[in-house]
């Protein structure tokens, strides 16, 4: 058993049917010695008396808010949460496995640039009695500071019969140099509590691996005289690291017909313009990627050919 | 990228082309190592990220773009003195800082070259003959060093009398390649920045 925060304790259980559970001794936080009784949650049933209460914690019915009283007055509370260990591995019931880029991806994180600012998000089908707390650091043995805000509900969507809820959090490395070569990964730790179940989720990454630039901005077409060709031009997104000559992007320009089945023409360039043939009813899209370190491509910025 | 690429002009800066080749070569070599050594801890998540140039060169600091010198987090400067007569500087007046930057890059390349050559000698003794260093990568390091053209003491190739532990050598190869790829990215950024200045 360990303390998550003041008066909130996590009991770690080897979780299987008919498991013996763990014996837990609760102590009433009071100088009083006599006339102390214990209750669980809203029940008035007295579980025991005395300054300490010994309980066998096996199931969720054994968890909850234990209160010690004396003569109708509340002396102290202890909230017991359960953390299930299933066959040697901590349970992951609360969050949805996003399975991208690999199995057991519960937290996904992205950064728009090298400033040390990043966003993480996760999914759940649980709508109520749910709290999250996020901590982060650079490295784990001698951690350097990363400050995270509060996790907020950022999207709701319907998936088949289920509603899915997306939560996200923004974090900022306290002293980040965009040009630095990372040797220690960023660690993100999310504590999740649903009713009386505690779980924790972690993600470890280098900012360079989670970079996903914003789409190029100011995408424009300029028809070339006496030609079906057009000059496409664009600019670096405002959120990208500067100077651009140091933090360079490479671009992919795509001409896509109205029908998804039509052949896509693609050109790659390091410049912020390209000449392409604009077919009728087609659209031109441009996306960006770090020129030197192949992390994710940005989303497409698009304009119609007409 | 196997699709058409609109290539930029090579520009005035003779080292840019070589640094691009270097990044391509080390990335290819790292990919090959990860595939060949799939049963070894060779992925970015599994290895310890060590920098053999730590406390010996200060490339990131010495090559910091002017715009980032105002960022205090970037000024974790270490005092290092370098020789300053590289041929990449030939076509323009350059500040002492730029010379310091390029000589720091040269020292990095020299250190990695020695490590890679020593390692290759060990790998050639491996009866499994599982993996060797790509000669193209070694050649590209050499070409960039020549383009930088700094006079510097030659570092003798390390020789080891004891029987090599091939498992450890292959893990060290992965560590070196990961670190060198990150340094090659920095070098490419620097060359691109200098080319644009």
């Amino acid at each position: 058993i360990w303390e998550l925060k003041k008066d909130v304790y996590v009991v770690e259980l080897d979780w299987y049917p008919d498991a013996p559970g763990e014996m837990v001794v609760l102590t009433c936080d009071t100088p009083e010695e006599d006339g102390i009784t214990w209750t669980l949650d809203q029940s008035s049933e007295v579980l025991g008396s005395g300054k300490t209460l010994t309980i066998q914690v096996k199931e969720f019915g054994d968890a909850g808010q234990y209160t010690c009283h004396k003569g109708g007055e509340v002396l102290s509370h202890s909230l017991l949460l359960l953390h299930k260990k299933e066959d040697g591995i901590w349970s992951t019931d609360i969050l949805k496995d996003q399975k991208e880029p690999k199995n057991k991806t519960f937290l996904r994180c992205e950064a728009k640039n090298y400033s040390g600012r990043f966003t993480c998000w996760w999914l759940t089908t649980i709508s109520t009695d749910l709290t999250f707390s996020v901590k982060s650091s650079r490295g784990s043995s001698d951690p350097q500071g990363v400050t995270c805000g509060a996790a907020t509900l950022s999207a709701e969507r319907v998936r088949g019969d289920n509603k899915e809820y997306e939560y996200s959090v923004e974090c900022q490395e306290d002293s980040a140099c965009p040009a630095a070569e990372e040797s220690l990964p960023i660690e993100v730790m999310v504590d999740a509590v649903h009713k009386l179940k505690y779980e924790n989720y972690t993600s470890s990454f280098f900012i360079r691996d989670i970079i996903k630039p914003d789409p190029p901005k100011n995408l424009q077409l300029k028809p070339l005289k006496n030609s079906r060709q057009v000059e496409v031009s664009w600019e670096y997104p405002d959120t990208w690291s500067t100077p651009h000559s140091y933090f360079s992007l490479t671009f992919c320009v795509q001409v896509q017909g109205k029908s998804k089945r039509e052949k896509k023409d693609r050109v790659f360039t390091d410049k912020t313009s390209a000449t392409v043939i604009c077919r009728k009813n087609a659209s031109i899209s441009v996306r960006a990627q770090d020129r030197y370190y192949s992390s994710s491509w940005s989303e497409w910025a698009s304009v119609p050919c007409s | 990228r196997n699709l058409p690429v609109a290539t930029p002009d090579p520009g005035m800066f003779p080292c840019l082309h070589h640094s691009q080749n270097l990044l391509r070569a080390v990335s290819n070599m790292l990919q090959k190592a990860r595939q060949t050594l799939e049963f070894y801890p060779c992925t970015s998540e599994e290895i310890d990220h060590e920098d053999i140039t730590k406390d010996k060169t200060s490339t990131v600091e010495a090559c910091l773009p002017l715009e980032l010198t105002k960022n205090e987090s970037c000024l974790n400067s270490r005092e290092t003195s370098f020789i300053t007569n590289g041929s990449c500087l030939a076509s323009r007046k350059t500040s002492f800082m730029m010379a310091l930057c390029l000589s720091s890059i040269y020292e990095d390349l020299k250190m990695y070259q020695v490590e890679f050559k020593t390692m290759n000698a060990k790998l050639l003794m491996d009866p499994k003959r599982q993996i060797f260093l790509d000669q193209n990568m070694l050649a590209v390091i050499d070409e960039l060093m020549q383009a930088l053209n700094f006079n510097s003491e030659t570092v003798p190739q390390k020789s080891s009398l004891e029987e090599p532990d091939f498992y450890k050598t292959k893990i060290k190869l992965c560590i070196l390649l990961h670190a060198f790829r990150i340094r090659a990215v920095t070098i490419d950024r620097v060359m691109s920045y200098l080319n644009a200045s």
Partner: antibody
């Protein structure tokens, strides 16, 4: 005590469907992840699928992905395996089992896919 | 296609000691715990060992498990006629958990 009883097996033609059930008793079914495991005649054990407590996370073996669906009804204490587009190689005894260091298995139900 | 390799068969006379090996890799046995099951003909598997070397109550102490690096083994001392069965090791892979990885299975024969 903990009991798992599989049902729904039988003989079915290739390409057809079958739905297996696993009735649980003697424990709080809604608190435990559940697996389906199968064993072809004379062969070893092969994991088929897993479902977490509320059914939001499901995992499948590559050999059944896209054809089989694992589900559960916690109000009925029952685990299901919907098997579509059945093939001869799906012929096996199908077991349900609890997830945990100490697991409980059902007695199995035989599925034969044959024309 | 199992990635945990066991010998197809082992045999021993009553009273003898036999061991069954289970060989995996860094991503499975190297990173996770191992279980062992006994399966008698026509019955469901029965748990013999969990957490590499722990015996559930009711399993005789003639059965013992161990794990080292990327392989595990089950030892049966004082072999008895009723030990004739199929034995399977089981672990997880860190990339595919919670999928169960079973060994190829070993037939233990007690020589008359």
């Amino acid at each position: 005590q903990v009991q798992l009883v599989e049902s729904g097996g039988g003989v079915v033609q290739p390409g057809r469907s079958l739905r297996l059930s696993c009735a649980a008793s003697g424990f709080t079914f809604s608190s435990y992840g559940m697996h389906w495991v199968r064993q072809a005649p004379g062969k070893g054990l092969e994991w088929v699928a897993f479902i977490r407590v509320d059914g939001s996370n499901k995992y499948y073996a590559d050999s059944v992905k896209g054809r089989f669906t694992i589900s559960r009804d916690n109000s009925k204490n029952t685990l299901y395996l919907q098997m579509n587009s059945l093939r001869a190689e799906d012929t096996a005894v199908y077991y349900c089992k609890t997830h945990g260091s100490h697991d409980n298995w059902g007695q199995g139900t035989m599925v034969t896919v044959s024309s | 296609q199992s990635v945990l390799t066991q010998p197809p068969s082992v045999s021993g006379a009553p009273g003898q000691r036999v061991t069954i090996s289970c060989s995996g890799s860094r991503s499975n046995i190297g990173s996770n715990t191992v279980k062992w099951y006994q399966q008698l003909p026509g019955t469901a598997p029965k748990l013999l060992i969990y957490y590499n070397d722990q015996r559930p109550s009711g399993v005789p102490d003639r059965f013992s498990g161990s794990k080292s690096g990327t392989s595990a083994s089950l030892a049966i001392t004082g072999l008895q006629a009723e030990d004739e069965a199929d034995y399977y090791c089981q672990s997880y892979d860190r990339y595919t958990h919670p999928a169960l990885l079973f060994g190829t299975g070993t037939k233990v024969t007690v020589l008359a």
